[in-house]
Structure formats: C-alpha cells, structure tokens
C-alpha cells in the first residue's frame, strides 16, 4: 500500500507581496502523474480555482492579472493523480500593498546613530491603524509586527533598538494595516537609511539584551522582547 501523495510546492512570482493593480502568478508544482491542480483560498468556498497541468504535467499556473483586495489571503494547492488527491501544500500568504495611504518613518533622535547607543524607529500613519510592520531591506524574514492589544487604533508605533550595532544599519520601510485583514497593507513609507557609526564592538550582542540580532542583517529579523511602553501595542511574530 502506497503512502499519501507528496504535497505540492506553492509559490508566487514575482513574489508574495504585491502592489495593488500589479499582476502575480501563483504556481503549484506536484508530480508528473498530476492530472489536475486545485487552488483553495482560506475562508472561501473550495475550489477557488482549478487548472490543467502544463507540460510536462508537474505544475500549473494560476494567473492574477490585476491584484485587488479580493485576491489577498492564504492559499493552498493540491493535485489529483490517478490514485487520488495529494496532501495540501504549505500555505502561501498573498499580501497586497496599497490598501491605505503610506505612513511616515523617522528615527529618534536621529538616523545617524553611534554604535552602542539607542535609536527608535517611529512609524506614523495619518489615520488610526492597529498594526504596524517594519521592513528591513534584504532581510530573510523582514516582517516585524506591532499590533494593538485590544483592537485599539493607534496613529504610530515605536520600534526601539538598543544597543545599536552595525547589524542594525540599513534601509527600512514601514507599513500600516488594520487587524481585520493581515493581508492588506498600506503603501510603503519612504525609505529610511539608518547609519551606524563608530562600530568597534562585536556586532553580535548577547541574547540577554532587549534587542537581539543573529549572525547578520541578511539572516534574521529584529527580535525585540517585551511590550512597547505607552503605546498599547504588542509585538507579534506571524
């Protein structure tokens, strides 16, 4: 007796974070025995879509010509072979940016900071929002969420970094969002360049400090601990 069919691989091109109006292609790759591919979207009646495989039958393409709010969400795909349906793929979270106006990102006291000192990145939105995200360019896991505790709406979120090391240097952007959909984000803020000067220390602060970073800026996101003072926001990893 053969075991369950292996799960397919699901991904999006050019990526899973798409600006409103832009096109995106969702790919599902199974096996050469696949006869049909099915794409399901969380909280929608299934199947969300269905496609015949492309030669040599080991994958299928689901095209979204123009990204809108309706397409944002969590997807899984399956394929059908002569022996039945596969296990579901790991989920793909398709996020749309451009749902709200862009926030402003600033650094306090300054974007030029000496190594070992403290800096706070401040993300401010014009209208009250309950989720703020900080993105660092070229980070493998770039999303850091600050979410309000009880759905309370905030105009800003603070991302404190202390002590600062060379690892923290780089280009940041932030987004704001409403909690009713984690998949709808604002336009990105203008980029903020954080410049760390006078770095003489080992850029690997001990994990007991309030902000820890791993081997380098390409490897890990910022990982703050504890709650944000006076903001009513709570840190979450999604």
């Amino acid at each position: 007796q053969a075991g369950p069919l292996p799960k397919p691989t699901l991904w999006a091109e050019p990526g899973s974070v798409i600006s409103w109006g832009n096109s995106v292609t969702i790919w599902c790759q199974g096996t050469l025995e696949a006869r049909e591919y099915r794409l399901d979207k969380e909280e929608s009646p299934a199947p969300w879509d269905r496609q015949n495989p492309l030669e040599p039958k080991n994958k299928a393409r689901f095209s979204i010509p123009s990204m809108t709010e309706d397409y944002a969400g969590r997807y899984r795909c399956y394929y059908r072979s002569p022996v039945g349906w596969s296990q579901p793929s790991d989920p793909l979270e398709l996020v749309m940016t451009g749902a709200y106006s862009k926030p402003t990102l600033s650094a306090l006291p300054s974007p030029l900071v000496t190594s070992g000192k403290s800096v706070t990145l401040l993300c401010q939105s014009r209208s009250p929002m309950d989720t703020f995200l900080l993105i660092k360019e070229r980070a493998a896991h770039p999303l850091l969420h600050l979410r309000s505790e009880h759905g309370a709406q905030q105009h800003q979120a603070e991302f404190p970094m202390s002590p600062v090391t060379s690892v923290h240097g780089g280009t940041y952007r932030c987004f704001s969002s409403h909690g009713f959909s984690h998949y709808l984000l604002s336009h990105p803020s203008d980029p903020l360049e954080l410049i760390v000067s006078g770095s003489l220390e080992d850029p690997r602060p001990s994990p007991t400090r309030s902000v820890s970073t791993a081997a380098g800026p390409e490897d890990q996101p910022l990982m703050p601990t504890g709650s944000v003072p006076h903001s009513g926001l709570r840190r979450h990893w999604e």
């Epitope: 399901d40 979207k41 929608s44 009646p45 299934a46 199947p47 969300w48 879509d49 269905r50």
Partner: nanobody
C-alpha cells in the same frame, strides 16, 4: 445534456418559505462550488448563496439570516431554504456550479435553466 437541474420554485405570500433544490451529476457536484444566483426582471444577475466542497458558505447581505444553503453529498443535491420571503426576493433563481474565482465574477462553469420564485404581498 443538462447537468444542473433546479426545482422547487413557485408562488408564495410575503413572510412565507420555499425550498429550492438543485441536482447535479456526481462529477460536477463533488468537485465544484455549488450555488444560487437570481435575476429579477430588468436587473443584473446576482449571487445569492454558495457552498464549497470544504463546507464554507457565502451569502449575499440581502439574504443573510433568512436563506440557508446546504449540500447533500449522498444525493449530489444542493438546497436553498428561503424563509421570511419578501416581494424583493421575486426573481428567476438559477443553480450554478464552478470554481469560486469564477462565481464571484458571475461566470461559473455550469448553469441550470432557472426556476421562478414569485413573492406576493
């Protein structure tokens, strides 16, 4: 060959109830979203309710709390239980089957012939 067939329409007084049925072939029923649209005279066809093979259901705001969609997998049949009917519910009701992506675009893969529901005051 008609692959989706509705029944159960008729004339009912305002405040009354009706149950529509839609029978489909096993192949269509087991692999598609099943749902109901309606089209009133001179108006655009609108999605009323739908149910997926995963059990997720969707309703138009105008029928929430009054209409219930259900599917009987043993009979390859989908039902629309309509309660507290009002004059505005008067329309031809169409059963449909297809993927959800097309459902929301009012272009499912399979359509029934339609059954008339008339609600009198």
């Amino acid at each position: 060959e008609v692959q989706v067939v509705e029944s159960g329409g008729g004339l009912v007084q305002a405040g009354g109830s009706l149950r529509l049925s839609c029978a489909a072939s096993e192949t269509i029923f087991s692999s598609n979203v099943m749902g109901w649209y309606r089209q009133a005279h001179g108006k655009q066809r609108e999605l009323v309710a739908a149910t997926g093979i995963n059990g997720v259901t969707k309703y138009a705001d105008s029928v929430k709390g009054r209409f219930t969609i259900s599917r009987d997998n043993a009979k390859n049949t989908v039902y629309l239980q309509m309660n507290s009917l009002n004059v505005e519910d008067t329309a031809v009701y169409y059963c449909a089957a297809g993927v959800w992506r097309n459902f929301v675009m009012r272009s499912p893969d399979y359509w029934g012939q339609g059954t008339q529901v008339t609600v009198s005051s």
